[in-house]
Amino acid sequence: QPNNSLMLQTSKENHALASSSLCMDEKQITQNYSKVLAEVNTSWPVKMATNAVLCCPPIALRNLIIITWEIILRGQPSCTKAYKKETNETKETNCTDERITWVSRPDQNSDLQIRTVAITHDGYYRCIMVTPDGNFHRGYHLQVLVTPEVTLFQNRNRTAVCKAVAGKPAAHISWIPEGDCATKQEYWSNGTVTVKSTCHWEVHNVSTVTCHVSHLTGNKSLYIELLPVPGAKKSAK
């Protein structure tokens, strides 16, 4: 056990490999095209290390001429995955990430899957469906979410430090009770952010402080009993 002045509480969510999808139910395929066109772009936050399925507009595959997935990831050339129905051929250009694949054969399912989403999958994904009635698009601004690791410790008398390490986007830290606080953010090259909040409590009847970390992946609270003021022996409450 560490000394209380450095007493550490840590938290990191463990995810079973979950799967997320914005795909529509097959029953909705019959909906009219104007609804599809009204939903051209979607912002989509996805937890890191989960599986994601991205969908094309809900158009029956029998009406299809060409399906193209265009993938634009930060710092990489645009990748395209295309399927031509007439010749039943698929073609890829500048696609190097083996975790981004068709869900199954594109003549059966036009959806795209990302297996075990990573930070590098942040980007824009667009399905373009060419049909006799025109071209239909659906785009996704995929935002990869990274759960921060949360720690709480004391570094000196009646001062506590709460850190939300390597979260994406940045976490928000609040305290119960409120103290005299300073918050700093540190930005990492992979797009994650570490937030550090250092607080001091002068009020001597504060026994335990709670750090509450709010994040898109979920909230976490940790608490710690404050050390006594040096030299303070007896206090009546």
Partner: antibody, heavy 114, light 107 residues
Amino acid sequence: QVQLVQSGAEVKKPGASVKVSCKASGHTFTSYWMHWVRQAPGQGLEWMGNIYPGSGSINYDEKFQGRVTMTADTSTSTVYMELSSLRSEDTAVYYCLTMTGTSWGRGTLVTVSS
Amino acid sequence: DIQMTQSPSSLSVSVGDRVTITCQASQGTPINLHWFQQKPGKAPKLLISGASNLEDGVPSRFSGSGSGTEFTFTISSLQPEDAATYYCLQFTYIPWTFGQGTKLEIK
């Protein structure tokens, strides 16, 4: 796994004093506050005070101020709670607890009767 | 001192029913708390720490929620062994203070 082992039941006369002990194991004794809570028969729970064994710093609830003394022996990882000038309404089970109230002793019954 | 108002003080509920107990901190002061279960002749047993964290080994039918000054303890489907008295404890300020307790009996 933190364990708190308390001393046995006591029967005292009004006006006397009682000293209850609580021996801790499984954590760094000097690094965690130790609290005392009591419960009179059929009543709720009442916080009495706490002690930080690392420095001997203490807080007493004002209700017990002047009658209660909490001490710690770091060599044996034991805390003590002494209550003086006992009266019948001090008949209660006395608990020690630590780790921000997440670990409790089994309690010590103190009966004050003439 | 922070007073913890716990309600109801007692209730009689059937097996399988949902039970809700609340604790409210006085003075509008935000606090953190634990929830305990106590059976006759036993020490209180911690069920929920830090308002909403289920302790290891505690059945998932128990849950806690809330923040700031208002907190709720819930048993989703009451079992016969849940007959006991339940307490909240605020541990943010000295003196620590308990709710008055809720005695839960099975109909």
